[in-house]
Amino acid sequence: SYQVICRDEKTQMIYQQHQSWLRPVLRSNRVEYCWCNSGRAQCHSVPVKSCSEPRCFNGGTCQQALYFSDFVCQCPEGFAGKCCEIDTRATCYEDQGISYRGTWSTAESGAECTNWNSSALAQKPYSGRRPDAIRLGLGNHNYCRNPDRDSKPWCYVFKAGKYSSEFCSTPACSEGNSDCYFGNGSAYRGTHSLTESGASCLPWNSMILIGKVYTAQNPSAQALGLGKHNYCRNPDGDAKPWCHVLKNRRLTWEYCDVPSCSTCGLRQYSQPQFRIKGGLFADIASHPWQAAIFAKHRRSPGERFLCGGILISSCWILSAAHCFQERFPPHHLTVILGRTYRVVPGEEEQKFEVEKYIVHKEFDDDTYDNDIALLQLKSDSSRCAQESSVVRTVCLPPADLQLPDWTECELSGYGKHEALSPFYSERLKEAHVRLYPSSRCTSQHLLNRTVTDNMLCAGDTRSGGPQANLHDACQGDSGGPLVCLNDGRMTLVGIISWGLGCGQKDVPGVYTKVTNYLDWIRDNMRP
């Protein structure tokens, strides 16, 4: 059945007959109310006020109509969409493209993608009408998306008389001569030619390699990126790019020193559904850098949960020094990544033994000054944790990072719901807190406990009545992350360290200030 629709030429959004919408007027503060009438949009200015709640992403300014419930977002440069959720500058997708929010709208066949809001897609499993459409990147546009965690972005196209899904031709960020690699680097086509030990790679067409499988003579050489060069490649699906080398006149192979392209701080955040004392139950995919550290105790059998930790690189976990006061032998420690339920194995979890751990040598167990430790995960190769939707590194902050006072940040952990609870949480929790100004992070605000320059404070600033559920860290969350959004990525700002009780009004939690330890971290992670 043929339907009359309107296409807003300014935004390229589509609307059904008699549907109304608001749109911002470019380069002015005016807002127009539009109405779809017989295939033509009729628009006029309407009065607006600031929205009563934030609805725009990426720094968009939200305005709502004075006399009815619709809202409109004035998007900053580089963003578009009803909620500024579209990144107009994204030129490629990373990993599977789950977080891709760019504007590519062509399928592999060359067909144009169908608008996700089209009524023709109403019965499809993924459309702009879904209640979680914004989170999935779907809406009033026809841009490629990957809402179902497929292998790459896709869209619906109209072909052979029906609407069906098709992969898009969106470029992958890992293609082309990138100087870093994504995933395991099988698509790496850069020009690095040195191994991790500093040895020079042999050319893939070298006579020395006769008899080897992966050489320029391989029938699939071109597709695998092999040829008359000595650049690092990963033709066999290994952990990362590698090459053949001569070591002491012996032919062998080594992993290369190609850096992996950073996907740190990116995640598929899902809005928590359940409130719980001190925070909200969360999924590990929302906090993929969260680690759970378990310890074997000399006196009791089995492992018990010890502390939280933070994945900062494939083989390194950051945590709190005070977690290791018992001086466990490294082989008594286990680190688990990718787990939502504290003691229930996750489908995609990754489990590691600990090679060694380093506690800051100036850690003060009275004041908890320098409350920081590093754990190196045990692995047979130079890679440990494999990146996935539930396992990913957090970004370390730039040395000069200074976030404004009262910036909203989040922490996560498997700790107690309240100070007097005898049990840790059975499920990962998250809490939303704000960074306190240093003037409010002093001894006098924390019952005369020592507060040093190596600490920062954060807490829930909502007005708390007796029934208030103020967010905070609690026992068992120690060593876990306090992260804040910076440059579009979740960035590690603090390590959960100590506090007075949990979730008390006007009593912030205290965190190790990560920017003070960047050189210490780098120094200790050296090969």
Epitope: G198, A399, L518, R522, R526
Partner: antibody, heavy 114, light 112 residues
């Protein structure tokens, strides 16, 4: 292969400042160190900067007088030394550190003379 | 600061003969992460220094196998099994375990 190319020679008056640059190509995610060598003398480590996050570590001797920075968009590290004295006359090297200082710049001669 | 003391100051050598340089640190240079960051660098006349040996005994890429490093704790040695004319220059030991990182005073190797 990492290559480090430094800026040209400088002549400065005592009390002035000098800023030496070091442009890197290849894997530039490693520490950049600065080492100096007075004529006929040995090597002296001044400090290091992590191009990734900008964190620095300086030798106590130069603390307060040296500033190391990096502009990642152009893969260039800088070393600025202020309040120059005649004994700061030296060749200044940048060196990239991964497992050691495997790659060195060609050196920049800084002459401090009134 | 960790003081690195090299000996001898000067080493006249005959091509084809072995040579040995000693380096002693004023304290242990085992890093808190367990590694010993003791390197050897060679500076040929008019050139930038070049890495020979890293982490006590690992030869850098392209370094001939006549060069070897050994030692632990505070005593370290660089050996050249058969000196060649191109090996002349100043050899420096270096510790990168404790800030400030420090170089030894250097050993000048010259052909007799």
């Amino acid at each position: 292969q990492v290559q480090l190319v430094q800026s040209g020679a400088e002549v400065k008056k005592p009390g002035a400042s000098v800023k030496v640059s070091c442009k890197a190509s290849g894997n530039t995610s490693y520490w950049i160190n600065w080492v100096r060598q007075a004529t006929g003398q040995g090597l002296e480590w001044m400090g290091r900067i992590d191009p990734g996050g900008g964190s620095t570590g300086y030798a106590q001797k130069f603390q307060g007088r040296v500033t190391m920075t990096v502009n990642t968009s152009i893969s260039t590290a800088y070393m600025e030394l202020s309040s120059l004295r005649s004994e700061d006359t030296a060749v200044y090297y940048c060196a990239s550190y991964y497992y050691a200082m495997a790659y060195w710049g060609q050196g920049t001669l800084v002459t401090v003379s009134s | 600061d960790v003081v690195m003391t090299q000996s001898p100051l000067s080493l006249p050598v005959t091509p084809g003969e072995p040579a040995s340089i000693s380096c002693r640190s004023s304290q242990s240079i085992v890093h808190s992460n367990g590694n010993t960051y003791l390197d050897w660098y060679l500076q040929k006349p008019g050139q930038s220094p070049q890495l020979l040996i890293y982490k006590v005994s690992n030869r850098a890429s392209g370094v001939p196998d006549r060069f070897s490093g050994s030692g632990s704790g505070t005593d370290f040695t660089l050996k050249i099994s058969r000196v060649e004319a191109e090996d002349v220059g100043v050899y420096y030991c270096f510790q990168g375990s404790h800030v400030p990182w420090t170089f030894g005073g250097g050993t000048k190797v010259e052909i007799k």
